[in-house]
């Protein structure tokens, strides 16, 4: 297993609709054809997997049908979008990139993006 540098923004404020997008960029030492991207969430020292996708270079990322993540790839960059976020989902979202094929296997883990989520203000009741 060889180490690889992964860069991601330090902090992102989610939209009022609970959507956050960020780029995860990896310094590929070779010509990988198969890449796996995993998003981990760290909050209160607990780490959980949010979503993961394996893709062939030049193809779309395919997450599971019920995943809250979508993404696109371009060269050594992965554009990740996480939706359906609520205030309780605020936390550090860490991008993990694995170059699966061809060997050697490379692993890179970013420092994390703090995604801050604000629940929208409830609409005031209106009398007609």
């Amino acid at each position: 297993c060889k180490a690889m540098h992964v860069a991601q923004p330090a902090v992102v404020l989610a939209s009022s609709r609970g959507i956050a997008s960020f780029v995860c960029e990896y310094a590929s030492p070779g010509k990988a054809t198969e890449v796996r991207v995993t998003v981990l969430r760290q909050a209160d020292s607990q780490v959980t997997e949010v979503c993961a996708a394996t893709y062939m270079m030049g193809n779309e990322l395919t997450f599971l049908d019920d995943s809250i993540c979508t993404g696109t790839s371009s060269g050594n960059q992965v554009n990740l979008t996480i939706q359906g976020l609520r205030a309780m989902d605020t936390g550090l979202y860490i991008c993990k990139v694995e170059l699966m094929y061809p060997p050697p296997y490379y692993l890179g883990i970013g420092n994390g993006t703090q995604i801050y989520v604000i629940d929208p203000e409830p609409c005031p009741d209106s009398d007609f």
Partner: antibody, heavy 118, light 108 residues
Framework: QVQLVQSGAEVKKPGASVKVSCKAS????????ISWVRQAPGQGLEWMGW????????NYAQKLQGRVTMTTDTSTSTAYMELRSLRSDDTAVYFC???????????WGQGTLVTVSS | EIVLTQSPGTLSLSPGERATLSCRAS???????LAWYQQKPGQAPRLLIY???SRATGIPDRFSGSGSGTDFTLTISRLEPEDFAVYYC?????????FGQGTKVEIK
């Protein structure tokens, strides 16, 4: 090294607007956020809101909603805070601060005194 | 909104003494999202502690933070002359982010 340099002191009349700038250097500007905090003479710190330089999304203190606008210009690594319909109780030192991975404000501007007086 | 209440309002101590500052939140705050700052007259605040207990870069180890839930503490183990200042806690756990009203540490 990380630096935040703010614009100079301003004197404004009640009802006017003020726009304070905060020029960042020494780091990748759009990877972080910028928060604005003010301090009235002899008083404590009041959080005004923040902007994610990455996507331009903003979060304002309810008290200032409708009067404040925070923006960034990533081409010049500068953040701006505009406050409208100024009142005498808006007289304060206005600070910008970098919002980082742990959200806490590790870097601050030197402060800009805004005086509202007729 | 989460209200942070700091106590005492003023702490009168001598250099070399231990200072214990309290910050109480009106609702539970994740310890990941509590910070402490020091401010001297005419200066911008300076980050001391983030994540309730992690020291910021360049902060001497006489400063320590602890606590969870609604009760947080900043401790200065041995006061140095340059430590006499006003100290603020701040929470990021929920919007709006809020500061405590401050504790002034003055020379006795």
């Amino acid at each position: 090294q990380v630096q935040l340099v703010q614009s100079g002191a301003e004197v404004k009349k009640p009802g006017a607007s003020v726009k304070v700038s905060c020029k960042a250097s020494g780091y990748t500007f759009n990877s972080y956020g910028i928060s604005w905090v003010r301090q009235a003479p002899g008083q404590g710190l009041e959080w005004m809101g923040w902007i994610s330089a990455y996507n331009g999304n903003t979060n304002y203190a309810q008290k200032l909603q409708g009067r404040v606008t925070m923006t960034t210009d990533t081409s010049t690594s500068t953040a701006y805070m505009e406050l409208r319909s100024l009142r005498s109780d808006d007289t304060a030192v206005y600070f910008c601060a970098r919002v980082g991975r742990h959200l806490a404000f590790a870097y601050w501007g030197q402060g800009t005194l805004v005086t509202v007086s007729s | 909104e989460i209200v942070l209440t700091q106590s005492p309002g003023t702490l009168s101590l001598s250099p070399g003494e231990r200072a214990t500052l309290s910050c109480r939140a009106s609702q539970s705050v994740s310890s990941s999202y509590l910070a402490w700052y020091q401010q001297k007259p005419g200066q911008a605040p300076r980050l001391l502690i983030y994540g309730a207990s992690s020291r910021a870069t360049g902060i001497p180890d006489r400063f320590s933070g602890s606590g969870s839930g609604t009760d947080f503490t900043l401790t200065i183990s041995r006061l140095e002359p340059e430590d006499f200042a006003v100290y603020y806690c701040q929470q990021f756990g929920s919007s709006p982010w809020t500061f405590g009203q401050g504790t002034k540490v003055e020379i006795k």
